[in-house]
């Protein structure tokens, strides 16, 4: 018979097998059962004998010869049903069949669980014609099956617009059992319990499940898979993994660290980023997090005078961005800084304490009992006025900065004068007659300029009058702020 | 509740042979492994090893290779212990224990006082 | 295999008192557990896995420990509690158990 050969897939080369039909794999296959049989064991290769009835679609051709005779109808003949074999080895299946030769351009597809199978596959196709009749066989072949492999193979056939399907053949692969959900790195609390999964599939099943905790087994009796394993709880940090054993061996899944929470290790390289009078803005590095993610920090302020009362100032803040600015602080003073953080388990010891200064600061007060007085014979307006309390002046005094505005008739000018800083007076000179001068004092620090104090008026009257009488501001009590912590 | 119920009390001549069963009840008996444990008189306790119920495959330390035994019954939920050739200083109450995760032996039979006298 | 030293062999103390009794390792175990057997009866889990407390067993007992170092402790001692307290660590095969502390009434 000539033989002609039609590769499905190029560029295969052609894999001719033994006729009708045939098996073939690089080891014999553990087990081939004929689909149709429920399973059971039987011979790998069952060809339909003539006249059976076949379970696969059938066409039924309509062509009739010469001599009318009815053809017969057109299936494929039966083949091994289900073929088990190992990961990795080779296997080749096929489907025949055999069609009158008035049907021209036949072709043959294969499909694997619904869904055809194109491009680089080894599919051939050969053709056995005869007198009446051509045998065509398609022959399946894999050269090093994988799990994915696994599934159903059917060949189909069109013909008349009819199509001919063949019975499926299942491919099974077995092996080394494979992970679907291995035990996961965790972090827990100390002698507390928690679980942890283990699933492995085969084929072959059933797949057994051992649990190992620092080398130890955990379970010296397997559990079927999937497998969950209760720890008791843990005092120290312990490595866990699982094997899955079948009938093929044994698979290790990767070990994985559980981890003890602890609290977390002080922050360290507290830096200085800016200061003013007033603040410091500081940041810190986080020690290692005891395997708990921080929550907050705690940055803990005391005054380095020696002679101050020791209270600490603490300000809390969140863990993130490692970044803090301390605000309510005195000008020109000493602190010391620590930085403490906490995760679920607890507080962190204090990080090394730091010295940090607040800069000068413009004064936070005004210049205390300002009196202003005309004095008629030197045309010049006398003021005196006491220094504002050394603690709030935030700085080393430079000076004063008086401001007069004189009002006249619509007319209002405003005057500035430095004077400076040993003096608690200054003289000024007449601007305006038949005016009001409003006279305010601030004290100056080379910080800054602080607060004026409240306006004092003096009528400064026309030429020939003569007033006495000073203006000036109460006293205050002492204004010093008490902080309590 | 679990339950391990052993057979009672036997008094064997030394080179004789005893078999002590232990049944268990209220639990599916192959999911857990049973373990042997020897308490000598006056003496502490001696885990002699264990049989995986599921397989049957039988597991003994170094004391107990040789004339000791561990086999089951799954049908009925029983484990048997043999001891052959019995010698004075097997005289000793045995134990089944039920085996879980971490060698924990959480249930306990009442014991089978197994004394040997010629 | 792993040799476990209870320590005090005997222990005296009266209902009320608080009763501590030791186990150490010849090296380091993974878990601990303890076990109370009385006169003519089975022993009795009481605490598995270091220090979790076995179904029925009250609060009163406790364990603790790791490495080498372990600890039953029984908080106030009641009557029932007289007894023989054994030991047996988990992590490496055989597994063996302590020879014993006796709690006896004083």
């Known amino acids: 018979a000539i033989t002609e050969a039609r590769e499905e897939a190029k560029p295969y080369p052609l894999f001719p097998g033994p006729f009708p039909g045939s098996l073939q794999t690089d080891h014999t296959p553990l087990l081939s059962l004929p689909h149709a049989s429920g399973y059971q064991p039987a011979l790998m290769f069952s060809p339909t004998q003539p006249g059976r009835p076949h379970t696969g679609n059938v066409a039924i051709p309509q062509v009739t010869s010469v001599e009318s005779k009815p053809l017969p109808p057109l299936a494929f003949k039966h083949t091994v049903g289900h073929i088990i074999l190992s990961e990795h080895k080779g296997v080749k299946f096929n489907c025949s069949i055999s069609v009158p030769n008035i049907y021209q351009d036949t072709t043959i597809s294969w499909w694997k669980d619904g869904k055809e199978l194109l491009g680089a596959h080894h599919a051939i196709t050969q053709f056995y014609p005869d007198d009446e009749v051509t045998a065509i066989i398609a022959s399946f072949s894999i050269t090093s099956v994988q799990r994915s492999d696994n599934g159903s193979y059917i060949c189909k056939m069109k013909i008349n617009n009819e199509e001919i399907v063949s019975d499926p053949i299942y491919i099974e692969v077995q092996g080394l059992p494979h992970f679907t959900k291995q035990p996961e790195s965790m972090n827990v609390t100390r002698n507390t319990a928690f679980n942890l999964t283990c699933q492995a599939v085969g084929p072959p099943e059933p797949v057994n499940i051992f649990w190992v905790q620092n080398s130890s087994r955990v379970n010296e009796q397997p559990e079927k898979s999937p497998s969950v394993l209760t720890v008791p709880g843990l005092t120290e940090m312990a490595v866990f993994s699982c094997e899955a054993h079948n009938d093929k061996g044994l698979t290790v899944s990767k070990g994985v660290q559980i981890n003890i929470k602890a609290i977390p290790s002080p922050p360290t390289e507290v830096s200085i980023r800016n200061s003013t009078a007033h603040s410091i803005l500081i940041s810190w590095v986080p020690g290692f997090d005891g395997y708990s993610p921080f929550r907050n920090c705690s940055i803990q302020v005391k005054e380095a005078d020696p002679l101050s009362n020791g209270s600490v100032m603490i300000f809390n803040t969140s863990a993130l961005p490692h970044l803090y600015q301390i605000k309510q602080l005195q000008a020109l003073a000493n602190y010391s800084i620590g930085v403490s953080c906490m995760n679920e388990i607890g507080w962190s010891a204090v990080s090394p304490w730091i010295l940090a200064s607040t800069t000068e600061g413009a004064p936070s007060v005004a210049p205390l009992n300002v009196t202003v007085f005309l004095n008629e014979s030197s045309d010049n307006v006398d003021i005196r006025w006491m220094k504002p309390p050394t603690k709030q002046q935030d700085g080393e005094l430079v000076g004063y900065r008086i401001s007069h505005v004189w009002q006249s008739a619509g007319i209002s000018k405003e005057l500035l004068e430095e004077v400076g800083q040993n003096g608690s007076r200054a003289r000024i000179s007449v601007q305006v007659h038949n005016a009001t001068c409003t006279v305010r004092i601030a004290a100056v620090t080379r910080g800054g300029v602080g607060p004026f104090s409240d306006p004092v008026k003096i009528f400064i009257p026309a030429h020939g009058w003569v007033d006495y009488a000073p203006s000036s501001t109460p006293a205050p009590g002492n204004a010093d702020p008490v902080l309590i912590i | 509740q679990v339950q391990l119920v052993q057979s009672g009390s036997e008094l064997k001549k030394p080179g004789a042979s005893v078999k002590v069963s232990c049944k268990a009840s209220?639990?599916?008996?192959?999911?857990?492994?049973m373990s042997w444990v020897r308490q000598a008189p006056g003496q502490g306790l001696e885990w002699m090893g264990w049989?995986?119920?599921?397989?049957?495959?039988?597991t003994y330390t170094d004391d107990f290779k040789g004339r000791f035994v561990f086999s089951l019954d799954t049908s009925v939920s029983t484990a048997y212990l043999q001891i052959s050739s019995l010698k004075a200083e097997d005289t000793a109450v045995y134990y089944c224990?039920?085996?879980?995760?971490?060698?924990?032996?959480?249930?306990w039979g009442q014991g089978t006082l197994v004394t040997v006298s010629s | 295999e792993i040799v476990l030293t209870q320590s005090p062999a005997t222990l005296s103390l009266s209902p009320g008192e608080r009763a501590t009794l030791s186990c150490r390792a010849s090296?380091?175990?993974?878990?601990m557990h303890w076990y109370q057997q009385k006169p003519g009866q089975a022993p009795r889990l009481l605490i598995y896995?270091?220090?979790n407390l076995a179904s029925g067993i009250p609060a009163r007992f406790s364990g603790s420990g790791s490495g080498t170092d372990f600890t039953l402790t029984i908080s106030r001692l009641e009557p029932e509690d007289f007894a023989v307290y054994y030991c047996?660590?988990?992590?490496?095969?055989?597994?063996?158990f302590g020879g014993g502390t006796k709690l006896e009434i004083k």
């Open positions: 224990a039920r085996y879980t995760n971490y060698g924990v032996f959480d249930y």
């Open positions: 090296s380091s175990v993974g878990y």
């Open positions: 209220s639990y599916t008996f192959t999911t857990y492994g």
């Open positions: 047996q660590q988990w992590g490496s095969l055989p597994f063996t």
């Open positions: 049989i995986n119920t599921d397989s049957g495959v039988p």
């Open positions: 896995a270091t220090s």
